[in-house]
Interface confidence: medium
């Protein structure tokens, strides 16, 4: 019998959920009342009381039904009287519900629907705290974000107050998250005071006053450590390149460094002055692995840039003359490394290439005349060719087009420093000018295991950026040109949790108090993934892995030399970012000199601009391994 | 060991300033909100200042609004509070903290405090 | 502001003992509740936050409970390390206050 009743109950909750599938729970046609004490939305933890009225034709009610989210209440529930019962729910705590109640007429066969309700429980918003507001150099815009306060579970609006100090113009910004206030629209002189209202259905609150210079809230362009050597001094030194493309003059960075195996950070402060690249001294211990981040703000000013991402260097054992080692940003080695070639020319670098110019040509040119000696001479030929191949460097003699061959995969793939073991198929572009050597590692998706409860903490750091994203991180990618252009992510913001001991500070704005689950966050987006048809990374370093496989584009006309700089600039912030859990809409944003670029790899590819399908992509990938062969 | 080493306290006037300062050891100091507190004899503590660990957000309570200045100096792994306009209320001891990973969690470290007296 | 509550001031406990010191908000903290060992000497020491959570290094015999509200702090076997004044704390909403504190006491 039981088993008889359970399967009515789903006949009818099946009954009912077709029969609004169209309209939802408001567009149902009721045959009574269904309301909610205190309100429909209500303050999370409350007890309610959900009435229910019948008012059915010829039916006077056996019985009162209530159901939440398609089941079947059983307790709880008094009738009051003839057509009306109430259901009394104890600290509830579900954030959405639907109700819906039935009545047990004479004479029907089913259960009648009486009526639906929504119901939400949530609560009031936080007073926003931590104001804060940006200008990105080259952005064109003001960011504007704050610390929502812990979760309110219900649809929660943020009012974003602008007043000019010297015109008492007041502006105002509605968004669910933070702001991105076109710097052209700040009419009103260079002073302003900022403020933020958050306003839902169970209350209002209001930010205090931030007051702000637009002359000092630049952050300046990304700073980036492109390369480290030691030199063999008398005592070893190492060397770290580092530049930005900004155009502030007066810039103070620092720039941090440690030992893997340390806990702590040891800072230099510099003054800068980015007009060449810079160069900084270390006297480090040899036979470590270092770890270096470099940071600047415009001087005196109140905002620093993130950190940049994580450059790794080893100091060698017994120090050569010089050890260059270039590019190496690490985005949490957990997975995928894939080395690329960028044909950076270096400065210090130059004579020596111009040298290994001259010996390649005077090489050929004796190898010429051998081999028109051994033409006419066989013996001297095979005699020859024996002394020939002692002398020259073995990859004079490979196949060099054939990459697998190549002694630079195989020292690739041996040398641990700069491979995974895990690492799949190497795709290296074959240059006769290569100077630096990139790596990139696509982390992969990591459970989310430290996940904060659902009323989750404010954070104690600072992060100028991305915490300027409530659910939504816009991710610049900066063309010198035409200013930044946003791209639009969307990732779980919670909290920026580079290592456990928590010795990385995220430098990008703080997360909101309290990130959605992943679990429940209807926008937390994974990010489509191009990696060479690795279909499993789920992480937002793919978007710079987007930026990166420019570099390996990057050999003719079709790539503007500005997209390196650029995707290097802004790695940090996405690199301090949990990984993802859901799935993205099939479209990703990529720079369109990229897009530019898969053209002439491939010409069969539509002509498509910046908005790029993702399934497009995916079906023309495989064919990029053209630049293999 | 996570160690707030506190100095500056002393015997001001009405009307006058001081400068307390906590030297911080043992963990990444621009990583962690750091606060002042200050306690009366036989009253509970009184939180009166916060400085987000690279100094973007800072708080007061009313009592000290406009009349105290939370600083750090993040390359010294100090902490500064900067008194002035001082009261006899003002008299406490007081104490520099530093939050957890989370402000709301609290104050996880605290110094061993010292002592300010205002008073004619 | 939100006014924590510590109604008991001073609570007298033998070693050994189960001991059990309160505290109540003014308005729900949701759970923002944080716990401190003030040693007759001056020390401070956070022992819980976030209602329940072991601060590290404290020995497991502290533990928190509650919600709303009310909460508490429960020393389950009384040390006589554990003499000391216990404050609560609310990091809910700034400005952030405590409790004026329980002293605890031998019998």
């Known amino acids: 019998m039981n088993q008889v009743t359970i399967q009515w109950d789903a006949v009818i909750a099946l009954y009912i959920l077709f029969s609004w599938c169209h309209g939802g729970i408001t567009n149902i046609n009721c045959s009574g009342h269904i309301w909610v004490e205190p309100a429909t939305i209500f303050k999370m933890g409350m007890n309610i009381s959900i009435y229910c009225q019948a008012a059915i034709k010829n039916c006077q009610p056996r019985k009162l039904h209530f159901y939440k989210n398609g089941i079947k209440e059983r307790f709880q529930i008094t009738r009051i009287n003839k057509t009306t019962a109430r259901l009394w729910y104890k600290n509830f705590l579900e954030p959405h519900a639907s109700m819906y109640c039935t009545a047990e007429c004479p004479k029907h066969f089913q259960e009648t629907l009486i009526c639906g309700k929504d119901i939400s429980s949530g609560y009031p918003p936080d007073i926003p705290d931590e104001v804060t507001c940006v200008i990105y150099e080259y952005s064109g815009n003001m960011t504007c974000t704050w610390n929502a306060g812990k979760l309110t579970y219900i649809d929660t609006k943020y009012v974003v107050h602008v007043k000019s100090l010297e015109t008492e113009e007041e502006q105002q910004y509605l968004t669910s998250s933070y702001i991105n206030i076109s710097t052209d629209s700040l009419q009103g002189g260079k002073k302003y005071l900022v403020w933020v209202q958050a306003a839902n259905a169970l209350g209002m609150e209001e930010s205090k006053q931030l007051q702000i210079h637009l002359d000092d809230i630049v952050i300046p362009s990304a700073a980036v450590i492109s390369r480290a050597e030691t030199i063999n001094a008398t005592v070893p030194k190492t060397i770290i390149y580092w530049d930005s493309q900004t155009t502030i003059e007066k810039v103070s960075c620092e720039m941090r460094y440690k030992a893997t195996t340390n806990q702590t950070w040891n800072v230099k402060e510099f003054d800068t002055n980015f007009t060449y690249v810079q160069q900084s001294e270390f006297y480090l211990e040899p036979n470590i692995k270092y770890v270096f981040q470099v940071r600047c703000q415009e001087t005196g000013k109140r905002y620093w840039q993130p950190w940049s991402s994580l450059f790794f260097h080893k100091t060698p054992e017994t120090v050569p003359q010089v050890t260059s080692k270039a590019f190496q940003h690490d985005t949490w080695n957990s997975g995928l490394t894939v080395a690329s070639i960028s044909t950076g020319h270096l400065t210090s670098d130059n004579r020596g290439d111009i040298g290994l110019l001259l010996g390649m040509i005077v090489f050929a040119v004796m190898l010429s005349i051998l081999s028109l000696i051994g033409i006419f001479n066989r013996s001297f030929r095979t005699g020859i060719k024996r002394r020939i191949l002692l002398l020259i460097p073995k990859w004079l003699y490979e196949d060099i087009p054939n990459m697998k061959n190549s002694n630079v995969v195989k020292m690739l793939q041996e040398n641990s420093e700069l491979m995974n073991n895990n690492s799949s198929e190497q795709v290296l572009y074959v240059d006769p000018m290569i100077t630096e050597i990139k790596e990139i590692f696509i982390p992969e998706h990591k459970p989310t295991d430290y996940k904060k409860e659902n009323t989750g903490p404010l954070e104690t750091r600072d992060y100028p950026q991305n915490s300027l994203f409530d659910n939504t991180t816009v991710v610049y990618i900066p063309d010198l040109n035409t200013g930044y252009k946003p791209q639009i992510s969307n990732f779980l913001p919670e909290g920026s949790h580079l290592s456990n001991n928590n010795e990385i500070t995220s430098l990008t704005l703080k997360p909101p108090v309290d990130s959605l689950d992943s679990g429940n966050n209807p926008r937390l987006q994974k990010h489509p993934n191009f990696a060479f048809s690795v279909s499993s990374v789920n992480s937002l370093s793919n978007t710079i892995f987007l930026g990166e496989l420019s570099l390996i584009l990057n050999q003719g006309e079709c790539s503007s030399p500005d997209i390196q700089n650029s995707v290097e600039e802004e790695t940090t912030m996405l690199l301090e970012n949990d990984s993802p859990s859901e799935t993205i809409p099939e479209q990703t944003l990529l720079p369109d000199e990229f897009v530019s670029c898969l053209g002439i790899v491939n010409e069969e590819l539509p002509s498509i601009n910046t908005y790029f399908p993702q399934n497009i992509l995916e079906s023309h990938f495989n064919r990029i391994s053209l630049l293999e062969k | 060991e996570v160690q707030l080493q506190q100095s500056g306290g002393g015997l001001v006037k009405p009307g006058g300033s001081l400068k307390l300062s906590c030297a911080a050891s043992g963990f990444t100091f621009s990583d962690y909100g750091m606060a002042w507190v200050r306690q009366t004899p036989r009253k509970g503590p009184e939180w009166i200042a916060f400085i987000s660990n690279l100094a973007y957000s800072v708080y007061y309570s009313d009592t000290v609004t406009g009349r105290f200045t939370i600083s750090r100096e993040n390359a010294k792994n100090t902490l500064y509070l900067e008194m002035s306009s001082l009261r006899s209320e003002d008299t406490a001891m007081y104490y520099c903290?530093?939050?957890?990973?989370?402000?709301?969690?609290?104050?996880?470290?605290w110094g061993l405090g010292t002592t300010v007296t205002v008073s004619s | 502001d939100i006014v924590m509550t510590q109604t008991t001031s001073s609570l007298s406990a033998s070693l050994g003992d189960r001991v059990t010191i309160s505290c109540r908000a003014s308005?729900?903290?949701?759970?923002?509740l944080n716990w401190y060992q003030q040693k007759p000497d001056g020390t401070v020491k956070l022992l819980i936050y976030?209602?329940?959570r072991l601060h590290s290094g404290v020995p497991s015999r502290f533990s928190g409970s509650g919600s709303g509200t009310d909460y508490s702090l429960t020393i389950s076997n009384l040390e006589q390390e554990d003499i000391a004044t216990y404050f609560c704390q609310q990091g809910n909403t700034l400005p952030w206050t405590f409790g004026a504190g329980t002293k605890l006491e031998l019998k």
């Open positions: 976030y209602t329940s």
């Open positions: 308005q729900d903290i949701s759970n923002y």
């Open positions: 903290a530093r939050h957890g990973d989370y402000r709301n969690y609290g104050f996880a470290y």
